[in-house]
């Protein structure tokens, strides 16, 4: 028969046959012949592969280094990698999760719109009329302005975007 | 810094039981693979089992089945080993230790001396 | 279970000397760990997965093999280097260490 030229999923082309690819958390010995089966071996503790492969060395799990300030979220198996995550207060700097920054901080004028998470930053938002933000926060949201009226009062110092309305005492009208 | 440090030596009479400890610092318990190794006096290392912190999953050398009993306290970062039934020839000293990662490359304790005397 | 043969179990090197020690499995291992033991002292793991250098070990060592055999090798003996050297799979349950090898200095 003609030797094949593409082989079926799950299998790889190798001195004309096709062979069984390794699966997940194991690596390749030796190929396959025509009388013998591909030979595979697992992957050892601290090691992993993720996909089925023809790979002759498995690959060392990440190493969440808390000197960067991550921390293992997902400890690895022999088929899949450790998974990092960023200690309280940062983020990680890439989808990767190599290293972490601390969490952004919102200024006054401005409000949180989403709160950091171990892969993402701090979302701002500038704080609209009627609302506002005295203090630099990761986690403050834009305040609205004391309503003078609900309290028997009336405005005496518009608010701004970094200052609540202060509110005073009613004029009394003389008779 | 990172430490392992294990409780201090014991002596115990025949047919007793021990329990050692392995506090680590520095890292958070679940992170890793505990196991443990024991060294007779004179002797080469002898692997006798491991303990996943992070959901109590052990497997031991059969050798130590039914002698050693692994487990561990993630709230205080703490590993034990019970050893039952204790003959001389469980005289050794024995040490927990890490699984690894590239940039820790294994911690280990300073062992604990294990002496069965009557 | 995997049973670790290592050779030699006990030698001697003058200062200078190349060192290999060795350590056959009974079926193929994914790698193999070694450590040094000195008197008195916990292990060490000195090198992982086969043949990468743990950190502060001195670039004379070195490690390799596949399958069932391995080696650690010492391209020039020093003095700090005596101690004993163990091999252990971390591959199939129960996890195995060699028998040790013994190396002191002449």
């Known amino acids: 028969p003609e030797p094949p030229t593409a082989c079926r999923e799950k299998q790889y082309l190798i001195n004309s046959q096709c062979c069984s690819l390794c699966q997940p958390g194991q690596k390749l010995v030796s190929d396959c012949t025509e009388f013998t089966e591909t030979e595979c071996l697992p992957c050892g503790e601290s090691e992993f592969l993720d996909t089925w492969n023809r790979e002759t060395h498995c690959h060392q799990h990440k190493y969440c280094d808390p000197n960067l300030g991550l921390r293992v979220q997902q400890k690895g198996t022999s088929e899949t990698d450790t998974i990092c995550t960023c200690e309280e207060g940062w983020h990680c700097t890439s989808e990767a999760c190599e290293s972490c920054v601390l969490h952004r901080s919102c200024s006054p004028g401005f409000g949180v719109k989403q709160i950091a998470t171990g892969v993402s930053d701090t979302i701002c938002e500038p704080c609209p009329v009627g609302f506002f933000s005295n203090v630099s926060s990761a986690f403050e949201k834009c305040h609205p302005w004391t309503s003078c009226e609900t309290k028997d009062l009336v405005v005496q110092q518009a608010g701004t975007n970094k200052t609540d309305v202060v509110c005073g005492p009613q004029d009394r009208l003389r008779a | 810094e990172v430490q392992l440090v294990q409780s201090g030596a014991e002596v115990k009479k025949p047919g007793a039981t021990v329990k050692i400890s392995c506090t680590v610092s520095?890292?958070?318990?679940?992170?890793?693979?505990i196991h443990w190794v024991k060294q007779r006096p004179g002797k080469g290392l002898e692997w006798m089992g491991r303990i996943d912190p992070e959901d109590g999953d052990t497997k031991y050398d059969p050798k130590f089945q039914g002698k050693a009993t692994m487990t561990a306290d993630t709230s205080t970062d703490t590993a034990y080993m019970e050893l039952s039934s204790l003959r001389s020839e469980d005289t050794a000293v024995y040490y927990c230790?890490?699984?690894?990662?590239?940039?820790?490359?294994?911690?280990w304790g300073q062992g604990t001396t294990v002496t069965v005397s009557s | 279970q995997i049973v670790l043969t290592q050779s030699p179990t006990i030698m001697s090197a003058s200062p200078g000397e190349k060192v290999i020690i060795t350590c056959s499995a009974t079926?193929?291992?994914?790698?193999i760990l070694w450590f040094q033991q000195k008197p008195g002292t916990s292990p060490k793991l000195w090198i992982y997965?086969?043949?990468n250098l743990a950190s502060g070990v001195p670039a004379r060592f070195s490690g390799s093999g596949s399958g069932a055999s391995y080696s650690l090798t010492i391209s020039r003996m020093e003095a700090e280097d005596a101690a004993t050297y163990y091999c252990q799979q971390r591959t199939f349950y129960p996890y195995t260490f060699g028998g040790g090898t013994k190396l002191e200095i002449k």
């Open positions: 230790t890490t699984s690894y990662y590239v940039g820790t490359y294994g911690y």
């Open positions: 997965s086969t043949s």
């Open positions: 520095g890292f958070n318990i679940k992170d890793y693979y």
């Open positions: 079926s193929s291992v994914s790698y």
